[in-house]
């Protein structure tokens, strides 16, 4: 079997050699070959090219399209690292400094309080909160932090929370607070991070992180 | 079970005022938005004035911009309208209700109260 094939195969090599040999000669204008034959041998000639051209043009446009594709669903990701601020609202504030992370323009961070994103979708989001606090210094109320959702056309709402009480240690306890969850969001849609006492919170090396990775 | 109980509606001349109460119970008050609707004698359903879960953001229809004041007491379960310059196109029955979205202009309530009734009449 394996013979046939290759007696196969150099019929094949054969007979195209042969054309191609036939091709030269109506071009070089040889008075052996009938002009019919030429004429009849070129527009077969140029058939298989134009075969060729095609296949290579569908070719590049399936890849240009995988490339499309990529392009449609590039990483969307942020971490940024908390900032100690001197205002006294309950919106942490954050800055893209020290190991942060800011993957493309698709995902910015505004006002250094909110991160914003341009392309619906299901996010993960996340938020490490360390703070200290004392029983004694603090209100009875706990500490609490909340991952907040504000998105065009719409009220700001809450998507998690935590609390945690005061420590006894004295000047202050360390406790660290961790949200993370899975949400759909719109374009334009910005998250922050609300706590009930910004003073409260540790701005050390690690500590206090806010980001999110589109899934 | 959700409730919401409108009262303050009544008979009032064209230039005065009224302050409509809306009391809600068996829902956590304080983490949704809230709305006014009104419905005028044989018209459909009118978007009034929203107000986000805690106080600050408030949006209100161009009819009544200027002249109307959404606000809320989440200490009490209380959401408030308090009506100014009022005119004879403002008599309607006024509804207190609560969305599970979170949009500024309402596009569907899950409960409502039974309405209050506004005539302003000369």
């Known amino acids: 079997h394996r013979r046939l094939d290759k007696i196969e195969d150099e019929r094949n090599l054969h007979e195209d050699f042969v054309f191609m040999k036939t091709i030269q000669r109506c071009n070089t204008g040889e008075r052996s070959l009938s002009l019919l034959n030429c004429e009849e041998i070129k527009s077969q000639f140029e058939g298989f090219v134009k075969d060729i051209m095609l296949n290579k043009e569908e070719t590049k446009k399936e890849n240009s399209f995988e490339m499309q594709k990529g392009d449609q669903n590039p990483q969307i990701a942020a971490h940024v690292i908390s900032e100690a601020s001197s205002k006294t609202t309950s919106v942490l504030q954050w800055a893209e400094k020290g190991y942060y992370t800011m993957s493309n323009n698709l995902v910015t961070l505004e006002n250094g309080k909110q991160l914003t994103v341009k392309r619906q979708g299901l996010y993960y989001i996340y938020a490490q909160v360390t703070f200290c606090s004392n029983r004694e210094a603090s209100s009875q109320a706990p500490f609490i932090a909340s991952l907040c959702l504000k998105s065009p056309g719409r009220f700001e709402r809450i998507l998690l929370r935590a609390a945690n009480t005061h420590s006894s240690a004295k000047p202050c306890g360390q406790q660290s607070i961790h949200l993370g969850g899975v949400f759909e969001l719109q374009p334009g849609a910005s998250v922050f991070v609300n706590v009930t006492d910004p003073s409260q919170v540790s701005h050390g090396t690690g500590f206090t992180s806010f980001g999110l990775l589109k899934l | 079970e959700v409730q919401l109980l409108e009262s303050g509606g009544g008979l009032v001349q064209p230039g005065g005022s009224l302050r409509l109460s809306c009391a809600a119970s068996?829902?956590?008050?304080?983490?949704?938005?809230m709305y006014w609707v009104r419905q005028a004698p044989g018209k459909g359903l009118e978007w009034v004035s929203s107000?986000?879960?805690?106080?600050?953001?408030?949006y209100y229809a161009d009819s009544v911009k200027g002249r109307f004041t959404i606000s809320r007491d989440n200490s009490k379960n209380t959401l408030y309208l308090q009506m100014n310059s009022l005119r004879a196109e403002d008599t309607a029955v006024y509804y207190c209700?609560?969305?599970?979205?979170?949009?500024?202009?309402?596009?569907?309530?899950?409960?409502w109260g039974q309405g209050t009734l506004v005539t302003v009449s000369s």
């Open positions: 209700a609560k969305s599970p979205y979170f949009d500024v202009i309402p596009s569907y309530f899950d409960y």
């Open positions: 068996g829902f956590t008050f304080d983490e949704y938005p």
């Open positions: 107000i986000g879960p805690s106080g600050p953001n408030t």
